[in-house]
């Protein structure tokens, strides 16, 4: 009798021990995971995060669609709606260069760096060549008339515009439009001005920064968060809190991301900080990620979202700050009338696009999203989409703009910058992070469930035997 009872009790004890061990392993395992993650996401020599941060292992592509103007003469002569036809994609490989001037500052636990710019054309991923021609707004004419509203200066400019045979629109190759060309009108200006113009001029052989970000050594919750940009905590482009540099650069976020979080990040392309909110769970190459999207609220007018009041910097074009979906970044572009929006004026007010024909906004193609692995905070896939527009206004001093009867926010191009973790990297990530966490979770569950089942089964058997013996 004793042997059987002893055996049952031993079984129950083993079950209990397994269950307790499984239960203990949960917080202990979580602690181990947290400890490992905290160690590996710090931005210092020797960590996984640092290696990928210095030079992204992901191939990043920037696709461009150019808005080819179909009716330049009618616009110039009759102030007609601008008819555009998008042509693209024209694809470039970008962000392939390693960060430069990386300097750790142990005093304040930051690391500073420059992000070099470079773009390599990818013909196989493009619809044409860099020599393709497009009819686009004359960037120099539109900008000059805006920067110099003074009537005297405009009369002088008008004579130079006419002399150079420039017009409201121009024909340019893709390479010229993106990376720069010598403008014939600006070449005649008798005082010192840059005669080269381009949507991204200068780009190659330049760098963005200096960025100074927290390395996470003192507090992992601050890792990758920008401390200063170009030596300042503010941008000097906006009023009040709109001018703050918030969050990271969106390449990664502090680890242990929650769905309820609002992820702040700074984008030098749009000269402001912005935010993303959780949208859905996504499985990316076997890795569970959170999809965060830029909400329409971020592009709303101050009427709809009072938080945006300091992004409205002028009253006329914005119709007393009631227009939405476009951001005037002229302060950040030496006074050039550049407006940023989502492609095809997605989330923009009807008055913005009423002067343009041929646009078809849709969320799937034109919104921006970030797919973030929540444990590490790494952005494993993203699509950054934005449109660059230029304001052109009537001018009764500049002949080629004289017949315009209204303001136009003219779309020049839109871009889609994408990056997705490669298959090899994903496999490595699965085995090193997801796999280990899943394995640990599995062991915890097996121990706990086997332990509980054993304990309950042996205890029932023991009780049954005891009651038989007593009878």
């Amino acid at each position: 009798g004793c042997d059987r009872n002893c055996g049952l009790i031993t079984g129950a004890v083993i079950g209990a021990v397994l269950a307790v061990f499984g239960g203990i392993l949960m917080p202990v395992g979580d602690m181990l995971i947290q400890k490992t993650i905290k160690k590996e996401v710090v931005l210092e020599e020797g960590t996984i995060a640092f290696k990928n941060w210095v030079k992204t292992g992901t191939e990043i592509y920037r696709q461009f669609w150019i808005f080819d103007v179909q009716n330049p003469q009618e616009v110039m002569m009759n102030s007609s709606n601008i008819q555009v036809k998008q042509r693209g994609p024209y694809t470039y490989r970008v962000r392939f260069l390693a960060k430069e001037n990386i300097t750790q500052d142990p005093k304040d636990n930051t690391v500073s760096f420059l992000q070099p710019n470079g773009a390599i054309f990818e013909p196989s991923l493009s619809v044409g060549t860099e020599a393709d021609n497009f009819t686009v707004l004359n960037l120099a004419v539109a900008a000059a008339s805006h920067i110099y509203p003074n009537p005297f200066v405009q009369v002088v400019l008008n004579s130079l515009i006419n002399k150079s045979k420039s017009s409201m629109f121009q024909v340019r190759t893709l390479r010229e439009l993106l990376w720069g060309y010598t403008d014939p009108f600006l070449s005649l200006v008798p005082y010192p001005v840059s005669t080269r113009v381009g949507m991204f001029y200068p780009y190659n052989n330049t760098a963005d920064g200096v960025y100074k970000v927290f390395n996470g050594k003192d507090s992992i919750s601050k890792v990758a968060i920008i401390d200063t940009y170009k030596g300042k905590r503010n941008l000097s482009y906006w009023e009040s809190y709109c001018d703050m540099i918030n969050g990271t650069d969106a390449a990664s976020f502090p680890p242990f991301v929650e769905k309820s979080q609002v992820l702040q990040f700074f984008s030098s392309d749009i000269c402001r900080s912005i935010y993303a909110v959780f949208e859905s769970d996504v499985n990316l190459k076997g890795i569970p990620v959170y999809r965060f999207v830029l909400p329409s609220k971020a592009f709303a007018s101050p009427v709809q979202n009072p938080d945006n009041h300091c992004f409205c910097t002028e009253k006329i074009i914005s119709k007393n700050c009631t227009s939405y979906g476009v951001l005037d970044i002229s302060k950040c572009k030496e006074g050039k009338p550049v407006y940023i929006s989502l492609p095809h004026f997605l989330y923009a007010s009807p008055d913005v696009s009423e002067t343009i024909d041929g646009l078809n906004p849709n969320e799937e193609e034109h919104r921006t999203y970030l797919d973030i692995e929540p444990i590490t905070g790494f952005t494993l896939q993203f699509a950054k989409r934005l449109q660059v527009n230029l304001l052109v206004k009537p001018s009764n001093k500049i002949q080629v703009l004289k017949r315009l009867k209204r303001n136009y926010i003219v779309p020049i191009l839109w871009l889609n910058e994408t990056g997705t973790i490669g298959d090899e990297k994903a496999k490595m990530f699965r085995s090193q992070v997801t796999g280990k966490i899943n394995l640990l979770g599995l062991i915890e569950m097996i121990l706990l469930s086997v332990g509980v089942v054993m304990f309950v089964a042996f205890m029932i058997s023991y009780c049954a035997c005891r009651s038989k013996t007593i009878k």
Epitope: Y148, P149, N150, P151, F152, V153, V155, V156, N158, S159, P190, Y191, P192, N396, K397, K402
Partner: antibody, heavy 118, light 107 residues
């Protein structure tokens, strides 16, 4: 309010030079063009030229090229016009006049009488 | 260079009468015509700017019209304070050019 105050009358000998000043106050000096206008006794007005202080861009009436030189001193918000190789033909009242955002000669100085006499 | 021909050179008008001054330009200047008033011993004063725009503070009896090459300046009912020289200025192109002026006197 916006004021343009010109230097006093000048009596100069033929062949000499003269530099007239126009001191401004009450506005952002660099953002508006400063023009100079000549008015001979009992005659109409003639535009000499203009200068945009922001970048120093100048434009002259061909008739006054070589005769007038326009300059500015941003630190003191003052515009200057120098007239050289003076003859009796140059005897006149010279005005400085400033643009407004979209308006020509919105504000005027009180005028400086230049008399060229041996 | 755009030449501006202003007429008449002088005009003698009784109080309450209508005054019309005309300026004709040698080139098409759209509506880039301005009108100035100059009283003795004073600098000119802008009355009407481009686009036939009456400047703030200028009495509504002053008006102008015209487009292209033919422009008219009108004083609806003459007052003694309107005695002055009047000049038109074309601001379409450089050099800026003035009309020869019209001397307006009381009859």
């Amino acid at each position: 309010q916006i004021q343009l105050v010109q230097s006093g009358p000048e009596l100069v000998k033929p062949g000499a030079s003269v530099k007239i000043s126009c001191e401004t106050s009450g506005h952002t000096f660099t953002e508006y063009t400063m023009h100079w206008v000549k008015q001979s006794h009992g005659k109409s007005l003639e535009w000499i030229g203009g200068i945009y202080p922001n970048n120093g861009a100048t434009k002259y009436n061909q008739k006054f090229k070589g005769k007038a030189t326009l300059t500015v001193d941003k630190s003191s918000s003052t515009a200057y016009m120098e007239l050289r190789s003076l003859t009796s033909e140059d005897s006149a009242v010279y005005y400085c006049a400033r643009d407004r955002y979209d308006v020509w000669f919105a504000y005027w100085g009180q005028g400086t009488l230049v008399t060229v006499s041996a | 260079e755009t030449t501006v021909t202003q007429s008449p050179a002088s005009l003698s008008v009784a109080t309450g009468e209508k005054v019309t001054i005309r300026c004709i330009t040698s080139t098409d200047i759209d509506d880039d015509m301005n009108w100035y008033q100059q009283k003795p011993g004073e600098p000119p004063k802008l009355l009407i700017s481009e686009g036939n725009t009456l400047r703030p503070g200028v009495p509504s009896r002053f008006s102008s019209g015209g487009y292209g090459t033919d422009f008219v300046f009108t004083v609806e009912n003459m007052l003694s304070e309107d005695v002055a020289d009047y000049y038109c200025l074309q601001s379409d192109n450089l050099p800026l050019t003035f009309g020869a002026g019209t001397k307006l006197e009381l009859k």
